[in-house]
Interface confidence: medium
């Protein structure tokens, strides 16, 4: 949270998560103010010289924009008068992480706010029954990932068991040499029973679960940000 | 509807500054993001670079050290410079309208001249 | 720099053939793909922009998809207007760069 009181506004950023090479958001609020001439948006970050992005008298203002971020930063343009100052960045890179700094002026005051960008890669998983093994087995896959991430298996009629032994995982590099494919191989999978892959790193979770009956295969992913 | 129109020397000697000027008319060169491509003879396509109406620039780094990009909003014009040119810079120069979403034209370039041949030759 | 590579680089083919052109970036670029054709002697002719978005005043017939790493150009009757160079350009950092090009001709 941003410093309030007398001449100065409350401004709020939330710690978020980039998907390299996806477009990705940066959040930040403030409080509304009707005069959009009046309003000052400054992105800095940590360890940069000139600015991310600077958005002022109802359009940006890019002469002080540092190199690396040209041509990849935008506000909401027509959502700044009701407090909203996040900053979109495309094809999130790697080094795009680090603490930011949301600075904010209005006619009613100033104020600021850091926020940690975090930066990776993180994917939905899929798991598919593997019919060409010699016994049934579940493969699961997820094309991107950064930094490698622990894979775990689990099941709902056996919770609590270990998996560590009848599964394989592997990561692939992929063609731009930085994430990675995870794959992953469940053995001796029994029908009638839910099984889920759980692929974690420090920024994302994502969960794949299978349910295999005699007469369909039922599945459902979802992935959730970490410290978000 | 909006036109552009380069203009400049055909010929060029080597070691020396090639610079040409895109004229705008039909429509304003303010919001908008102005480029340069060039095309050598028989070849693909590379950008040089692009330029915003308030002047901000990007160059393409392989020609960054000899590229100038600069807009005279007032006279709707804007201009490229490329200096100390070889026979390697022969080629058609474009000029090019450019809108986009993040400070660049990332929509693609809508409107374009219709080129001008540069010859760089003693 | 992300290179884009263009398959094929000549594509011989006929009027109503649905033709397709394949794209390929060195390293994910999302959406920020356009594509452009251009005829002998011209300048190139906006088709498509953001990988899928048709150009006002493009036929559409021409239609654009794909995202991450892969994207394709599809005609889906071919036209004798058609009959031109078609170039992918990734719009996602700069520089931006554009394929080598794909030349359709009469088949």
């Known amino acids: 949270f941003g410093i309030s009181g007398k001449h100065f506004i409350t401004v709020t950023t939330f710690t978020s998560a980039g998907n390299i090479g996806e477009d990705g958001t940066l959040s930040c609020t403030f409080e509304p103010d009707i005069k959009l001439n009046g309003i000052v948006i400054q992105w800095l970050k940590e360890g940069i010289k000139g600015l991310v992005h600077e958005f002022k008298e109802g359009k940006d203002d890019l002469s002080q924009q540092h190199e690396m971020f040209r041509g990849r930063t935008a506000v909401f343009a027509d959502q700044v008068v009701v407090g909203n100052a996040s900053l979109r960045l495309k094809n999130v890179q790697l080094t795009d992480a680090g603490t930011y700094t949301c600075y904010i002026r209005t006619s009613k005051g100033k104020g600021n706010a850091n926020l940690e960008y975090k930066t990776g890669a993180f994917s939905m998983p899929e798991i598919n029954v593997d019919y060409n093994a010699s016994s049934e087995s579940l493969r699961c896959e997820a094309p991107r990932w950064f930094p490698q991430p622990t894979v775990a298996w689990a099941s709902q009629v056996d919770q609590g068991a270990n998996f560590s032994e009848v599964s394989n995982t592997s990561f692939e590099l992929n063609s731009e040499n930085v994430t990675m494919k995870v794959v992953s191989v469940l053995y001796n999978v029994t029908i009638n029973n839910t099984y889920s892959c759980m692929i974690e790193n420090d920024i994302a979770k994502a969960t794949g679960d299978i349910k295999v009956t005699d007469s369909e295969v039922k599945r459902r992913s979802q992935l959730q940000l970490l410290n978000s | 509807q909006v036109q552009l129109q380069e203009s400049g020397p055909g010929l060029v000697k080597p070691s020396e500054t090639l610079s040409l000027t895109c004229t705008v008319s039909?429509?304003?060169?303010?919001?908008?993001?102005w480029g340069w491509i060039r095309q050598p003879p028989g070849k693909g396509l590379e950008w040089i670079g692009y330029i915003y109406s308030s002047g901000s620039t990007s160059y393409n780094p392989s020609l960054k050290s000899r590229v100038t990009i600069s807009v005279d909003t007032s006279k709707n014009q804007f201009s490229l410079k490329l200096s100390s040119v070889t026979a390697a810079d022969t080629a058609v120069y474009y000029c090019?309208?450019?809108?986009?979403?993040?400070?660049?034209?990332?929509?693609?370039?809508?409107?374009w001249g219709q080129g001008t041949t540069v010859t760089v030759s003693s | 720099d992300i290179q884009m590579t263009q398959s094929p680089s000549t594509l011989s083919a006929s009027v109503g053939d649905r033709v397709t052109i394949t794209c390929r970036a060195s390293?994910?670029?999302?959406?920020?793909l356009a594509w452009y054709q251009q005829k002998p002697g011209k300048a190139p002719k906006l088709l498509i922009y953001k990988a899928s978005s048709l150009e006002s005043g493009v036929p559409s017939r021409f239609s654009g998809s794909g995202s991450g790493t892969e994207f394709t150009l599809t005609i889906s009757s071919l036209q004798p207007d058609d009959f031109a160079t078609y170039y992918c350009q990734q719009d996602n950092s700069f520089p931006f760069t554009f394929g080598g090009g794909t030349k359709v001709e009469i088949k």
């Open positions: 039909g429509g304003s060169i303010i919001s908008y993001y």
């Open positions: 390293q994910s670029i999302s959406s920020w």
């Open positions: 090019a309208r450019g809108s986009g979403l993040y400070a660049a034209p990332d929509y693609g370039l809508d409107v």
